[in-house]
């Protein structure tokens, strides 16, 4: 049976959950070291195609899985990315402060791909201003 | 037709354990995060506990931390709450709820419920 | 931990507009959705992420975000509207609701 709801990720839930993982942490994942990628090349399917090898690790399960609906349904973010730097590994919470640094900035600079992210940027500014995290 | 059907419910003496079942039928079980949510007598609408498609994360609310348990067998499309040392204040309906995202956000379906008494 | 909070209740006329106020520190940075819950039954989602209506629900029922408040509304509220409302937002890896409002249609 079919949800009468078709939810899918929206840019604030990405970036709060990208904040709530990396605040005050210094290491992600046991410090797992993953290919370093090019975001401007697509940022869903390209940080998912490295994250997706991470396993064992339910700090960073949310976050795959909205990559996941992300890049599966934006196709014109790119596909998953040919142009990986193979060569070179960083720590998966220097990938993910990466992608969070990225997708503000896109956002920032007015690089939009539609209202929709037009009235997500509006709200990720708000965020990025006013932004109170709580903790347990 | 989505359908949770809850069981399990009972009165209990505190300190006392239960076992909720969550039966789910019209639709892939094995597919949903599921979680539940408890409503006590006269009260608001409060979450208790999460778990993804496949078992492998779960969270719960610190109210309950370390005192209950969330379990799913997909095989038998059936979702779990092992509630132990229970406390009077535990007392509500608890409700099995299905979400339909794949990252955990909200919940689309609700079953009845089913009453848990905690009661000396 | 996040905390939503609601007015305990609302009273609107017979086919007038009832507003529903859900407030929460930086509730727009959030998705917000919406639940509708009648004496003895189970919770219905009325809105979904902050203003999406799912199937089967009339179109006088809306939401928005702004600021530090979402808010539900009701343009022309029925009796058959008369029930709690709960605002939910998702905040600490778990699901957050709202207190909750009871919404009286008067006539």
């Known amino acids: 049976s079919p949800s009468p709801v078709t939810p899918s990720p929206t840019l604030k839930e990405l970036i709060e959950e990208l904040v709530n993982i990396t605040q005050n942490q210094a290491s992600l994942c046991n410090g797992s070291m993953v290919w370093s990628v090019n975001l401007t090349a697509g940022m869903y399917c390209a940080a998912l195609e490295s994250l997706i090898n991470v396993s064992d690790c339910s700090a960073i399960q949310r976050t795959q899985r909205m990559l996941k609906a992300l890049c599966s349904q934006k196709p014109a973010a790119g596909q998953i990315s040919s142009e990986r730097s193979r060569d070179t590994k960083i720590e998966v919470i220097q990938l993910v402060k990466n992608l969070l640094t990225y997708v503000r900035g896109v956002y920032r600079h007015g690089n939009f791909r539609g209202l929709n992210d037009i009235f997500e940027a509006q709200k990720i500014e708000w965020h990025e201003h006013h932004h109170h995290h709580h903790h347990h | 037709e989505v359908q949770l059907v809850e069981s399990g419910g009972d009165s209990v003496r505190p300190g006392g354990s239960l076992r909720l079942s969550c039966v789910a039928s019209?639709?892939?079980?094995?597919?949903?995060?599921m979680g539940w949510v408890r409503q006590a007598p006269g009260k608001g609408l409060q979450w208790v506990a999460w778990?993804?498609?496949?078992?492998?994360?779960?969270s719960y609310a610190d109210a309950v931390k370390g005192r209950f348990t969330i379990s799913r067998d997909n095989a038998k499309d059936t979702l779990y709450l092992q509630m132990d040392d229970l406390r009077v204040d535990d007392t509500a309906v608890y409700y099995c709820?299905?979400?339909?995202?794949?990252?955990?956000?909200?919940?689309?379906?609700w079953g009845q419920g089913t009453l848990v008494t905690v009661s000396s | 931990s996040y905390v939503l909070t609601q007015p305990p209740s609302v009273t609107v006329p017979l086919r007038q507009t009832a507003r529903i106020s859900c407030g929460g520190d930086?509730?727009?940075?959030?998705?917000v959705h919406w639940y509708q819950q009648k004496p003895g039954q189970a919770p219905v989602l009325i809105i979904y992420n902050d203003s999406n209506r799912p199937t089967g629900i009339p179109e006088r029922f809306s939401g928005s975000n702004s600021g530090n408040m979402a808010t539900l509304t009701i343009r022309g509220a029925l009796a058959e509207d008369e029930a709690d409302y709960y605002c939910q937002v998702w905040a600490n890896d778990g699901y957050v609701f709202g207190s909750g409002t009871q919404l009286t249609v008067l006539g």
């Open positions: 709820a299905r979400d339909p995202s794949s990252w955990g956000s909200l919940f689309d379906y």
């Open positions: 930086n509730i727009r940075s959030k998705n």
């Open positions: 778990i993804y498609d496949g078992g492998s994360r779960t």
């Open positions: 019209g639709f892939t079980f094995s597919r949903y995060n």
